[in-house]
Interface confidence: medium
């Protein structure tokens, strides 16, 4: 380690985990508690992120790296670096302004987050429905009727429901 200071910027030799202390003859002082510097040559240390409330600590802050948060059970991360926590729903539901709602008929959600997506339209690919879709699962498309061997039959798509359910489970 070259301990001679740069003539241009004496702070350039200060490593991560320190700040260049102008009040103390520009020595490299350790970052104070609850702060960090992830790069060298910094004149201040950054305040550590605090994982509070619905956020929980995934990685503690150190003198060289910020804390990382994730979400408490029942919530999931949104945004860069988990900047927000959004409520989980059940599979077969999506989060609306009024809370978790069942997927409308013809749509599904196989995760606890995100929105309900339409079932695959098998006929667009010239295929038939092999397994019906549900609120939690997409349809499974099978071979086209022309590909079926004699005597085989495709599953008949279900008749549409009169009114999709919207009551939360």
């Amino acid at each position: 380690f070259e301990r001679t200071r740069s003539l241009q910027d004496p702070c350039s030799n200060c490593p991560a985990g320190t700040f260049c202390d102008n009040n103390r003859n520009q020595i490299c002082s350790p970052c104070p508690p609850n702060s960090f510097s992830s790069a060298g040559g910094q004149r201040t240390c950054d305040i550590c992120r605090q994982c509070k409330g619905v956020f929980r600590t995934r990685k503690e802050c150190s003198s060289t790296s910020n804390a990382e948060c994730d979400c408490t059970p029942g919530f999931h991360c949104l945004g860069a670096g988990c900047s927000m926590c959004e409520q989980d729903c059940k599979q077969g539901q999506e989060l609306t302004k009024k809370g978790c709602k069942d997927c409308c008929f013809g749509t599904f959600n196989d995760q606890k987050r995100g929105i309900c997506r339409p079932w695959t339209n098998c006929s667009l690919d010239g295929k038939s429905v092999l397994v019906n879709g549900t609120k939690e699962r997409d349809v499974v498309c099978g071979p086209s009727p022309a590909d079926l061997s004699p005597g085989a039959s495709s599953v008949t798509p279900p008749a549409p429901a009169r009114e999709p359910g919207h009551s939360p489970q």
Epitope: F1, P15, G17, T18, C28, P30, P32, S63
Partner: antibody, heavy 118, light 107 residues
Framework: EVKLLESGGGLVQPGGSLKLSCAAS????????MSWVRQAPGKGLEWIGE????????NYTPSLKDKFIISRDNAKNTLYLQMSKVRSEDTALYYC???????????WGQGTTLTVSS | DIVMTQSPATLSVTPGDRVSLSCRAS??????LHWYQQKSHESPRLLIK???QSISGIPPRFSGSGSGSDFTLSINSVEPEDVGMYYC?????????FGAGTKLELK
């Protein structure tokens, strides 16, 4: 259990040199700043200097920076204090200390004694 | 360098007493003030960090207060094993400095 064990002290003639060691165990040595602090007989505590976890910054109390060199070997979990041109006023008990997040000395060794005498 | 002044130099106490040890910094150091206990022929031991934060394993009878330049270490019911030297330390400035200490002894 955090343990710090200094060694290498002894009787040295004025103008001589000596290297003290501090063996660390019970914690991740490579993640902590480490310091040396000394205590002259019947006197208070005097901070000597500190070293960054990866040795990329080393700070000394200004009056001692030309005669002491602090180093560390993370592979051996060991901190060192190289002393040169020692004088009678360097006679003291030398402690190594772990620095918690800056300059809180949360664990101390038992100390090793340097006696400078002709 | 910042000068740390401790008072009194010696404090004679009776077990069960509540005592206060003072530490004054020559300029403001915010709450970057740490207290150590050193018993005879032993190493220093961290008692309080950042003026008032307790340390795991330290008996709750030890507490700290203060900010800026005036700080106090309190022992709310002195035990015989508390005799020894008590040092305050400035962790804010460079170089970090210790007070000269307060000697706690039994009457």
């Amino acid at each position: 259990e955090v343990k710090l064990l200094e060694s290498g002290g002894g009787l040295v003639q004025p103008g001589g040199s000596l290297k003290l060691s501090c063996a660390a165990s019970g914690f991740d040595f490579s993640r902590y700043w480490m310091s040396w602090v000394r205590q002259a007989p019947g006197k208070g505590l005097e901070w000597i200097g500190e070293i960054h976890p990866d040795s990329s910054a080393i700070n000394y109390t200004p009056s001692l920076k030309d005669k002491f060199i602090i180093s560390r070997d993370n592979a051996k979990n060991t901190l060192y204090l190289q002393m040169s041109k020692v004088r009678s006023e360097d006679t003291a008990l030398y402690y190594c200390a772990r620095s918690y997040y800056g300059r809180v000395f949360d664990y101390w060794g038992q100390g090793t004694t340097l006696t400078v005498s002709s | 360098d910042i000068v740390m002044t401790q008072s009194p130099a010696t404090l004679s106490v009776t077990p069960g007493d509540r005592v206060s040890l003072s530490c004054r910094a020559s300029q403001s150091i915010s709450d970057y003030l740490h207290w150590y206990q050193q018993k005879s022929h032993e190493s220093p031991r961290l008692l309080i960090k950042y003026a008032s934060q307790s340390i795991s394993g330290i008996p709750p009878r030890f507490s700290g207060s203060g900010s800026g330049s005036d700080f106090t270490l309190s022992i709310n019911s002195v035990e015989p094993e508390d005799v020894g030297m008590y040092y305050c330390q400035d962790g804010h400035s460079f170089p970090p400095t210790f007070g000269a200490g307060t000697k706690l002894e039994l009457k």
